[in-house]
């Protein structure tokens, strides 16, 4: 699985979209985790609603929000008020039983706002523009994207 590199500006929001085969992953909850070291475990940051059909509802842990469109096969993670310490390697996961299948690996890079070091004068950014989709440096082919789950179902809690 290739790694997608996303860049976001410090203080802004970075939105990550992981696409997956909706029918293959039928019934499964999704999660966003942070990789601890290159070979280390992936520490869960946030997972989707415990009830599969309510996965479209946003779930938050601190400044990270997750929501899953289970029909379209897109899980969206928003990292709000991005900080330098948020930089690192993450995974979108599909949960089944006690196992987690990696849907996509994402390297988050945080760029310092150049205006922080200058007199910004009267320059301002409207509230609506403060969500940054991220500069996608390298896009990986994540899993097969046919609209198409082992069936190991995942609704309620996690594995």
């Amino acid at each position: 699985l290739n790694t997608t590199v996303l860049q976001g500006m410090a203080g802004q929001s970075l939105r990550v979209s992981c696409t997956y085969d909706a029918l293959k992953h039928w019934g499964r909850r999704k999660a966003w985790c942070r990789q601890l070291g290159e070979e280390g475990p992936c520490q869960r940051v946030v997972s989707t609603h415990g009830v599969w059909l309510l996965a479209f509802l946003k779930k938050r842990n601190g400044s990270t929000v997750i929501a899953d469109d289970t029909l379209a096969g897109t899980v969206t993670i928003t990292l709000k008020n991005l900080q330098a310490g948020d930089a690192g390697l993450y995974q979108c996961q599909s949960l089944r039983g006690r196992e987690a299948e990696v849907l996509q690996k994402v390297l988050v890079e945080v760029l310092e706002d150049p205006l922080d070091d200058q007199d910004a004068g009267d320059l301002w950014v409207p509230e609506e523009s403060s969500s940054f989709e991220g500069a996608q440096v390298e896009h990986s082919t994540s899993r097969n994207q046919e609209t198409s789950f082992p069936p190991t179902s995942h609704h309620h809690h996690h594995h």
Partner: antibody, heavy 125, light 107 residues
Framework: EVQLVQSGAEVKKPGESLKISCKGS????????IGWVRQMPGKGLEWMGI????????RYSPSFQGQVTISADKSISTAYLQWSSLKASDTAMYYC??????????????????WGQGTTVTVSS | DIQMTQSPSSLSASVGDRVTITCRAS??????LGWYQQKPGKAPKLLIY???SLQSGVPSRFSGSGSGTDFTLTISSLQPEDFATYYC?????????FGQGTKLEIK
């Protein structure tokens, strides 16, 4: 009609190779997990593994990992189970089955809702 | 692997009887469990999915219950065609695993 049709009975000698098939029709084969189940004579059902033909994702039971190979050709809606070197203990009935998708309450579930008729494999010297 | 223990392994009953078969998982599997019926020389047939939901076309005398580790299949009033072997299957975790089966025989 939604169905899985398996290849015919096989009689083989120990050490020989074999590949049996399971052809789906009446549904979108590539978007369903397909499982394989063994039933030795007079015994219960044993789950061998599954494949998702859409991207060839395969999961084996540890009991069968390295003993058999599961594969699929999505262009002809067919899943396969193969052995490179048969043993007498492989004598059994083998079933393929589709994992149907269900919604119950607010959860998404699976059940093996469509089964092949079974393929009898006999291994004897 | 998750072990599924079915009991009893065999059961003699009469037409009209109420019969209960149980399945216990070695660890919690939520409600990711199905029940299957198999008659001699035939492929298994799905009766119940999600522990308690009746598969389309299956008579309402069959019902399932349970969650976590303990599950039950009940046949409220046995009919002649119900004499068969019944299996539970967990599909919460890989590898999916069957119970060893319960053979239901005519008394």
């Amino acid at each position: 009609e939604v169905q899985l049709v398996q290849s015919g009975a096989e009689v083989k000698k120990p050490g020989e190779s074999l590949k049996i098939s399971c052809k789906g029709s009446g549904f979108s084969f590539n978007t369903y997990w397909i499982g394989w189940v063994r039933q030795m004579p007079g015994k219960g059902l044993e789950w061998m593994g599954i494949i998702y033909p859409g991207d060839q994702d395969i999961r084996y039971s540890p009991s069968f990992q390295g003993q058999v190979t599961i594969s699929a050709d999505k262009s002809i809606s067919t899943a396969y189970l193969q052995w490179s070197s048969l043993k007498a203990s492989d004598t059994a009935m083998y079933y393929c089955a589709r994992y149907g998708r269900y919604i119950y309450g607010y959860g998404g579930y699976h059940g093996m809702d469509v089964w092949g008729q079974g393929t009898t494999v006999t291994v004897s010297s | 692997d998750i072990q599924m223990t079915q009991s009893p392994s065999s059961l003699s009953a009469s037409v009209g009887d109420r019969v209960t078969i149980t399945c216990r998982a070695s660890q919690a599997i939520r409600d990711d469990l199905g029940w299957y019926q198999q008659k001699p020389g035939k492929a298994p047939k799905l009766l119940i999915y999600a522990a308690s939901s009746l598969q389309s076309g299956v008579p309402s005398r069959f019902s399932g219950s349970g969650s976590g580790t303990d599950f039950t299949l009940t046949i409220s009033s046995l009919q002649p065609e119900d004499f068969a072997t019944y299996y539970c299957l967990q599909n919460y975790n890989y590898p999916h695993t069957f119970g060893q089966g319960t053979k239901l025989e005519i008394k």
